[in-house]
């Protein structure tokens, strides 16, 4: 197959891939807000054999505007053609196409974390699913940022196998009675643009020698 | 009703060139992908290539690098240029609304407009 990607503006839909918990979402929007579709359906091919477009049969007919494809891309090494078809009733209202290779296009959404502060550390608890497929690993790293009084700090764990259960990190050396904030997010090697996660913060609570300086008050 | 008119189809040696048309009415062209399929003597439909509504082009591998699809959305005009053809491109060529999916689609609505490829 032969392909070209030029800057037109008239596609009728964006679409973008993302990895939500390890899961490859794809999502999209219309740009013309007034085509209101009752529902959509999703087909997809790879780019080394176009005839052979197969409907997503869990994004057939579907009034969502994003799909799970995790059991249907597999390959990174792969270019995958989405086409999507927008209808009112049985009218075909749009139908547009993007072309995506996962390894350049897929943005990574933030783990979902905890943290518990104590008097002079943090622990930051990552939650992972419980099995992540080797495919979808993406040679990502994991960065949890600390900061403090307009100072960051990155602290990037080593994880032992894959990224799948729930990890803890201990964020240790920390000053008492002093507020911390922490994000977390997954970086690719081929540094792409990271999402953060918003901030978490808590205040530490004071250490022994403030308590009893407090209490001899 | 969606309406397709094709035309630009004739007799050509190998090696030879034709520039196919689809004329479009009936639906916002802009907003559909368009796609050729062909039916040689005999056989079923093909799906030849496709373009979206942006301009994303795709080719089946037997004309990679010999037609070139392209669309005028201000005309609501489909093109395909075949270049270099050979005797086994000879066939009723056909227009589709949307990317068209055999077993899936229905058959495109238009007359086609006959290529023959022979020395």
């Known amino acids: 197959i032969s392909y070209d990607s030029p800057d037109y503006t008239d596609e009728s839909c964006t679409f973008k891939i993302s990895l939500r918990n390890f899961r490859s979402i794809l999502s999209w929007e219309l740009k013309n807000h007034s085509i209101v579709p009752t529902h959509y359906t999703l087909l997809y091919t790879i780019m080394s054999k176009p005839e052979d477009l197969k409907v997503v049969k869990n994004c057939a007919n579907t009034t969502r505007s994003f799909c799970d494809l995790t059991d249907e891309w597999r390959s990174t090494h792969e270019a995958y053609v989405t086409v999507l078809e927008g209808f009112s009733g049985n009218t075909t209202l749009f139908s547009c196409s993007h072309n995506f290779w996962l390894a350049i296009d897929m943005s990574f959404e933030p783990p979902e974390f905890e943290i518990v502060g104590f008097t002079n550390h943090i622990n930051v608890m990552v939650k992972f699913p419980s099995i992540v497929e080797e495919e979808l690993q993406f040679d990502l790293s994991l960065v949890i940022e600390e900061q403090s009084e307009g100072i960051v700090k990155k602290h990037k764990p080593e994880i032992k196998g894959n990224m799948s259960g729930n990890f803890t990190y201990i964020i240790d050396k920390l000053i008492p009675n002093t507020n911390y904030c922490v994000s977390v997010y997954l970086e690719h090697s081929d540094e792409q643009a990271v999402i953060k996660s918003p901030l978490k913060c808590t205040l530490l609570p004071p250490g022994q020698e403030s308590e009893s300086a407090e209490s001899a008050k | 009703q969606v309406q397709l008119q094709e035309s630009g189809g004739g007799s050509v040696q190998p090696g030879g060139s034709l520039r196919l048309s689809c004329a479009a009415s009936?639906?916002?062209?802009?907003?559909?992908?368009m796609s050729w399929v062909r039916q040689a003597p005999g056989k079923g439909l093909e799906w030849v290539s496709a373009?979206?509504?942006?301009?994303?082009?795709y080719y089946t591998d037997s004309v990679k690098g010999r037609f070139t699809i392209s669309r005028d959305n201000a005309k609501n005009t489909l093109y395909l240029q075949l270049n270099s053809l050979k005797t086994e491109d000879t066939a009723m060529y056909y227009c589709?609304?949307?990317?068209?999916?055999?077993?899936?689609?229905?058959?495109?609505p238009g007359q086609g407009t006959q290529v023959t490829v022979s020395s």
């Open positions: 589709a609304q949307n990317w068209w999916v055999a077993g899936r689609s229905p058959n495109p």
């Open positions: 009936g639906f916002t062209f802009s907003n559909y992908i």
């Open positions: 373009i979206s509504g942006g301009g994303n082009t």
